[in-house]
Interface confidence: low
Amino acid sequence: SSSPTSSASSFSSSAPFLASAVSAQPPLPDQCPALCECSEAARTVKCVNRNLTEVPTDLPAYVRNLFLTGNQLAVLPAGAFARRPPLAELAALNLSGSRLDEVRAGAFEHLPSLRQLDLSHNPLADLSPFAFSGSNASVSAPSPLVELILNHIVPPEDERQNRSFEGMVVAALLAGRALQGLRRLELASNHFLYLPRDVLAQLPSLRHLDLSNNSLVSLTYVSFRNLTHLESLHLEDNALKVLHNGTLAELQGLPHIRVFLDNNPWVCDCHMADMVTWLKETEVVQGKDRLTCAYPEKMRNRVLLELNSADLDCDPILPPSLQTS
């Protein structure tokens, strides 16, 4: 199928990194970098499982789909894909599994048609807040990105900076409000314990959000209200115990939503009553008949849809004078 046809914009030589980062010689039309496979007809270049340590400088100008998976890139510097003339048609860039541990500010600058970016399966210990926005301005030029795949980018425990991994990722997503047009965001398998409360409100175009296989315990402070276009929300394989009324109402109010909640350790006590009532009425939960209780022990494996209010009790909290040590 066809892809973007943006005209190549000329570079200003005043850009500070261009002297070192930009390939000055235009590549020959049919040139293919060493260790890569190229198809001009498919506008595709594949440099896969080649243990490359840097992005090839001589990428053909026609490239629309670039696969640089299974390499050893380690660091993506500023302007890693800046070329003269620019790679004006590059729309899909897959860098998954390339041992990236650092993505610097402006790494994806000068890619005017970049719609889809996959950085999955890289241990990103250092993701610059300006990796996607390219500048530290409070409001950056809009990024053309509409699909950002960041599954399993959490580094091993001993390689993490002394800061919140969730915070680092969210800072990159929100910097300069550059990703306002983002439509698909995948953040699966990242050990997220929480979702910073402001992140979704600033990504209003999202259609698909994948937060599966994390460690989310609660959505109490997360608002979905602004995500009026959201079509799928993947929350499978987290540590969710219950969804409260506010969250339920917000999800129910989204016109196109499908929610996936499998494999969470639902706690079936008195706090679950609202969620069970909602589940029985709603059509937005995919596979709702598969949801089962994990706690308390007496409720384990009970199907949520089959519970009634009598099943959902909380042990009474005794006044201090009656408690035993």
Epitope: T5, A92, R115, E147, H208, H229, R258
Partner: antibody, heavy 125, light 107 residues
Framework: QVQLVQSGGGLVQPGGSLRLSCVVS????????MSWVRQAPGKGLEWVSI???????FYADSVKGRFTISRDNSKNTLFLQMNSLRAEDTAVYYC???????????????????WGQGTLVTVSS | EIVLTQSPATLSLSPGERATLSCRAS??????LAWYQQKPGQAPRLLIY???NRATGIPARFSGSGSGTDFTLTISSLEPEDFAVYYC?????????FGQGTKVEIK
């Protein structure tokens, strides 16, 4: 080769029912989004209904509660069940794939491509 | 819902001439706009998507431009088979909506 072949149109009285079919070849109806779009005689195009790959269905306000979109995965066929038909439902009805033009497993923006050949539904007494 | 207004309603031109069709949205649709061509008795055909990208198999004489609320479809040099009705369509906000169409006819 991708093809959408429609059938089921015809003349029906107000208040009556009709079921349109759209047989798909070249891709699987269950793995894509599918829509119905209609065109009243001499008029423009109006989106009617959509079914997502996950099974969610949505309708234009003008047909909500009267029309039902569905599919039969085993027959690779899309349906539009139209009940309580009115004169203003008279139109050529087209099925169309709601297509992501960039590929690479993305769903970020979808357009109607390709379309079925259309089938005329006339509601008149 | 977003209203798309196309102009002119009819464009009378000769083969070889340049056609410029306009589509204006009642609010911003970013670049989430497509153009379709429909010939009498036929189904519409996707020409341009995401405002400026040609669909598969569409000749280079068709081009799209614009973003936000103002969009243009240009046919650089009309061929006999290009005389048809052209519709714009947005996919930015729900529901999907179409313009009322511009008819390009032979002068």
């Amino acid at each position: 080769q991708v093809q959408l072949v429609q059938s089921g149109g015809g003349l029906v009285q107000p208040g009556g029912s009709l079921r349109l079919s759209c047989v798909v070849s070249g891709f699987t109806v269950s793995s894509d989004y599918m829509s119905w779009v209609r065109q009243a005689p001499g008029k423009g195009l109006e989106w009617v209904s959509i079914i997502y790959s996950g099974g969610s269905t949505f309708y234009a306000d003008s047909v909500k509660g009267r029309f039902t979109i569905s599919r039969d995965n085993s027959k690779n066929t899309l349906f539009l069940q139209m009940n309580s038909l009115r004169a203003e439902d008279t139109a050529v009805y087209y099925c169309a794939r709601d297509r992501d033009c960039h590929g690479w497993g993305s769903y970020y923006n979808r357009w109607f491509d390709p379309w079925g050949q259309g089938t005329l539904v006339t509601v008149s007494s | 819902e977003i209203v798309l207004t196309q102009s002119p309603a009819t464009l009378s031109l000769s083969p070889g001439e340049r056609a410029t069709l306009s589509c204006r949205a009642s609010q911003s649709v970013s670049s989430y706009l497509a153009w379709y061509q429909q010939k009498p008795g036929q189904a519409p055909r996707l020409l341009i998507y995401d405002a400026s990208n040609r669909a598969t198999g569409i000749p280079a004489r068709f081009s799209g431009s614009g973003s936000g609320t103002d969009f243009t479809l240009t046919i650089s040099s009309l061929e006999p088979e290009d005389f048809a009705v052209y519709y714009c369509q947005q996919r930015s906000n729900w529901p999907p909506t179409f313009g009322q169409g511009t008819k390009v006819e032979i002068k």
